[in-house]
């Protein structure tokens, strides 16, 4: 059995997350994950899910009753999602920690917007008419 | 020229993001994007970057001076990053809107944790011994 399972069960007890009513009103993540089979689509969604869990764990990091469980699960996420690659994890953390209300961050983000947009899709690297053809081509091959 | 370029330039003026001092202390996103060539790694990072911009745009959505620019850029992101797929965009938005301080959301998230973890890496779907070999192999290749 994976080490995270026992620790996740411990978290369930702590949060009373085993109660039957928890399943009311659908799932947060599971139904969404079921919608996406393509690896790149899954990564878009899992990126948001992992950042949610990291924020959640941060809020409870000083609670001794679940500290070991949280650390074990975070370690397991680092192995599974970040492939034990600390640079990947660090870059991810940087992105999740930027404050959207900080005026210096806002200015930098807007300053970088054109280059970020240019990289959002592989097709975006060529002229507009060619790109529209490429969108079609990519559509046709999907 | 891509339609978003003119609108991004308009945002630059609005945020004074063309000033020389904006480049001080490195980039927010560009250096991170340069680090990752693999499509799935890029999606992990871009997912966070896109959610940052969406939050930023939300904060300024009522400012008439930049409304058209923001709408054009959001449309462009939807075409490029979400492939004009509204279901993908809707699922993404749901994930970004969950409140990490809501106790019902916390309980649901913990309830779903084991299944989310089980899906974090494709390797997680096979026997544990095989998986640990696969992790070693994948790490070695990165």
């Amino acid at each position: 059995q994976d080490p995270y399972v026992k620790e996740a069960e411990n978290l369930k007890k702590y949060f009373n997350a085993g109660d039957p009513d928890v399943a009311d009103n659908g799932t947060l993540f599971l139904d969404i994950l079921r919608n996406w089979k393509e690896e790149s689509d899954r990564k878009i969604m899992q990126s948001q899910i992992v950042s949610f869990y990291f924020k959640l764990f941060k809020n409870f990091k000083d609670d001794q009753r679940i500290q070991k469980s949280v650390e074990t699960i975070k370690e397991d996420i680092n192995v599974k999602f970040f492939n034990s690659n600390k640079k990947k994890r660090d870059d991810f953390e940087k992105l999740t920690n930027y404050s959207v209300t900080d005026s210096n961050v806002q200015r930098k983000a807007v300053h970088e917007l054109i280059q970020v947009m240019a990289e959002l899709s592989p097709a975006a690297k060529i002229g507009k008419r060619k790109r529209s053809q490429m969108f079609r081509g990519r559509r046709a091959s999907q | 020229q891509d339609p978003y370029v003119k609108e991004a330039e308009n945002l630059k003026k609005y945020f004074n993001a063309g000033d020389p001092d904006v480049a001080d202390n490195g980039t927010l996103f560009l250096d991170i994007l340069r680090n990752w060539k693999e499509e799935s790694d890029r999606k992990i990072m871009q997912s966070q970057i896109v959610s940052f911009y969406f939050k930023l745009f939300k904060n300024f959505k009522d400012d008439q001076r930049i409304q058209k620019s923001v709408e054009t850029i959001k449309e462009d992101i939807n075409v490029k990053f979400f492939n004009s797929n509204k279901k993908k965009r809707d699922d993404f938005e749901k994930l970004t809107n969950y409140s990490v301080t809501d106790s019902n959301v916390q309980r649901k998230a913990v309830h779903e944790l084991i299944q989310v973890m089980a899906e974090l890496s494709p390797a997680a779907k096979i026997g544990k011994r095989k998986r640990s070999q696969m992790f070693r192999g994948r790490r070695a290749s990165q």
């Epitope: 091959s141 | 449309e75 462009d76 509204k86 279901k87 938005e93």
Partner: antibody, heavy 124, light 111 residues
């Protein structure tokens, strides 16, 4: 009230060109994607092309690529479909249909509002 | 090649329930929204279900839509069948980047 009105259909000969138009009203036109969908007599619906709102990206059916061109004039609330090298099998009722507002996550449904169509007949 | 396959025809008696299926040939049905349209002779298509299971205003709750990932298909269910429901019904979805796909259509006959 959302309205889409197509015009410009008619009888043309094989090999000819024709441009059909669509004028929209009742909504912020530049925010919405617009689709062209056609229906041959007694047949099903076939998607032809789409043009995005402010960015004006063009998307085409694989089978029609190269012969058809979609464009729009946001100042005139108008969309155009230019058809060249027309064939008998292009004979159809051409519908203009409102798409999503992709700048708004709470956009009204795609393909909710349809025009009445304009009939294009290709025959010698 | 991407296809949405519907039965050519379906029939039912007034007051009964009918189901029209729409099977996606490749790609996951769950990865794109599905819409359903009703078309009566001489009229433009009118949406009866959007985004898998939602009804536009004015569409009665006798009409419902669902998606089943296991069979990679969507379904339109009409309960309490009425004579005015007699029409052609088309499912619609997408593939790739904004490429729109329609099913071949199903003729509903109310007996």
């Amino acid at each position: 009230e959302v309205q889409l009105v197509e015009s410009g259909g008619g009888l043309v000969k094989p090999g000819d060109s024709l441009t059909v138009s669509c004028v929209a009203s009742g909504f912020t036109f530049s925010n919405y994607f617009i689709h062209w969908v056609r229906q041959a007599p007694g047949k099903g619906l076939e998607w032809v092309a789409t043009i995005s709102g402010r960015t004006k990206y063009m998307f085409y059916s694989d089978s029609l690529r190269g012969r058809f061109t979609v464009s729009r004039d946001n100042a005139q609330n108008s969309v155009y479909l230019h058809m060249s090298s027309l064939r008998g099998e292009d004979t159809a009722l051409y519908y203009c249909v409102r798409g999503y507002d992709h700048s708004d996550s709470n956009s009204a449904a795609d393909l909710l509002h349809w025009g009445r169509g304009t009939l294009v007949t290709v025959s010698s | 090649n991407f296809m949405l396959t519907q039965p050519l025809s379906v029939s039912g008696y007034p007051g009964k329930t009918i189901v029209i299926s729409c099977v996606r040939s490749s790609g996951s049905v769950a990865s794109h929204y599905v819409q359903w349209f009703q078309q009566r002779p001489g009229s433009a298509p009118a949406m009866v279900i959007y985004e898998d299971s939602h009804r536009p205003s004015g569409i009665p709750d006798r009409f419902s839509g669902s998606v089943d990932a296991s069979s990679n298909s969507a379904s339109l269910t009409i309960s309490g069948l009425k004579t005015e429901d007699e029409a052609d019904y088309f499912c619609q979805s997408y593939y790739g980047n904004n490429q729109v796909l329609f099913g071949g259509g199903t003729k509903l006959t109310v007996l």
